[in-house]
Amino acid sequence: MMTGTIETTGNISAEKGGSIILQCHLSSTTAQVTQVNWEQQDQLLAICNADLGWHISPSFKDRVAPGPGLGLTLQSLTVNDTGEYFCIYHTYPDGTYTGRIFLEVLESSVAEHGARFQIP
């Protein structure tokens, strides 16, 4: 039975040219996290594997940095980075948990962080 929940940074916004940290946190389960995938639509950005370490997709290596923790830092943001991001937690024995973050990249300096929320 999957009892865990993923808490994410929710809906966030950031300035064009700036950077943003995407964070998810898995709680309420004793399952072992074996891997976390960070994906944008169908594109893989990065993987943090408990045994293999971090892998950043070649097409993102200049703009993506691992961490902090299991999170991901996006740098040199463009308006094309606006969209949904998913953290996919592979756990044992529970299975897979998925969290969603919506990032809006703004042209001006009106960017603010949205509220945190939970995805069961």
């Epitope: 994906e39 594109q43 893989l44 594997n49 045994d51 293999l52 370490g53 892998h55 997709s57 070649p58």
Partner: antibody, heavy 118, light 107 residues
Framework: QVQLQESGPGLVKPSGTLSLTCAVS?????????WSWVRQPPGKGLEWIGE???????NYNPSLKSRVTISVGKSRNHISLKLSSVTAADTAVYYC???????????WGQGTLVTVSS | SYELTQDPAVSVASGQTVRITCQGD??????ASWYQQKPGQAPILLTY???TRPSDIPDRFSASSSGDTSSLTITGAQAEDEADYYC??????????FGGGTKLTVL
């Protein structure tokens, strides 16, 4: 220099269990390193079977997962492979291999042919 | 079936340049590694990463990638390059996948 030496029965009966051992020398099982098994049926291509990490965690080819067990020997310089319920389709040269992190296989054993036949 | 697709056979005249390709969705997220295998021998690693060769691999072997395709180029193919060539990568579940192999004939 890393050396990998596979050993085990060259003939296994159908429905039986294939058991192979890989003797590892020149390197210790260390953080970030993994040990894997790859097979190659006669005249065909390479197929990854699975791997084991320093932590003891394993990762298996989904198509073989229900039949495969990879483990580290008590002496920690041997890796073992067990493949259950074998059929003639499991006849292959079995290679013990190693690598580190997300990098590819960088060392291979010389391989050992296992034939499944009654 | 293989998740990475290779042409089964390719031929090249001695001294000429040949390109062996590998296609698959995982190559959008992972660089391919390339292996050479001669009859009765274990494979050896030729290239990995963006285009890195182990120190004992001749520089006539090089790799490149674009989109979902990785290529191994042999510049000035020699008779001893006649072999089977396999591409490999991880997938997003951290599984290792291999291509079906390409048999290179040097004429």
């Amino acid at each position: 220099q890393v050396q990998l030496q596979e050993s085990g029965p060259g003939l296994v009966k159908p429905s039986g269990t294939l058991s192979l051992t890989c003797a590892v020398s020149g390197v210790s099982i260390r953080q970030g390193h993994w040990w894997s098994w790859v097979r190659q049926p006669p005249g065909k291509g390479l197929e990854w079977i699975g791997e084991i990490y320093q932590t003891g965690r394993t990762n298996y080819n989904p198509s073989l997962k229900s039949r495969v067990t990879i483990s580290v020997g008590k002496s920690r310089n041997h890796i073992s492979l067990k493949l259950s319920s074998v059929t003639a389709a499991d006849t292959a040269v079995y290679y013990c291999t190693t690598g580190s992190g997300w990098y590819p296989i960088d060392y291979w054993g010389q391989g050992t042919l296992v034939t499944v036949s009654s | 079936s293989y998740e990475l697709t290779q042409d089964p056979a390719v031929s090249v005249a001695s001294g000429q340049t040949v390109r062996i390709t590998c296609q698959g969705d995982s190559l959008r997220s992972f660089y391919a590694s390339w292996y050479q295998q001669k009859p009765g021998q274990a494979p050896i690693l030729l290239t990995y990463g963006k285009d890195t060769r182990p120190s004992d691999i001749p520089d006539r072997f090089s790799a490149s990638s674009s989109g979902d395709t990785s290529s191994l180029t042999i510049t000035g193919a020699q008779a001893e390059d006649e072999a089977d060539y396999y591409c490999s990568s991880r997938d997003r579940s951290a599984n290792v996948v291999f291509g079906g192999g390409t048999k290179l004939t040097v004429l």
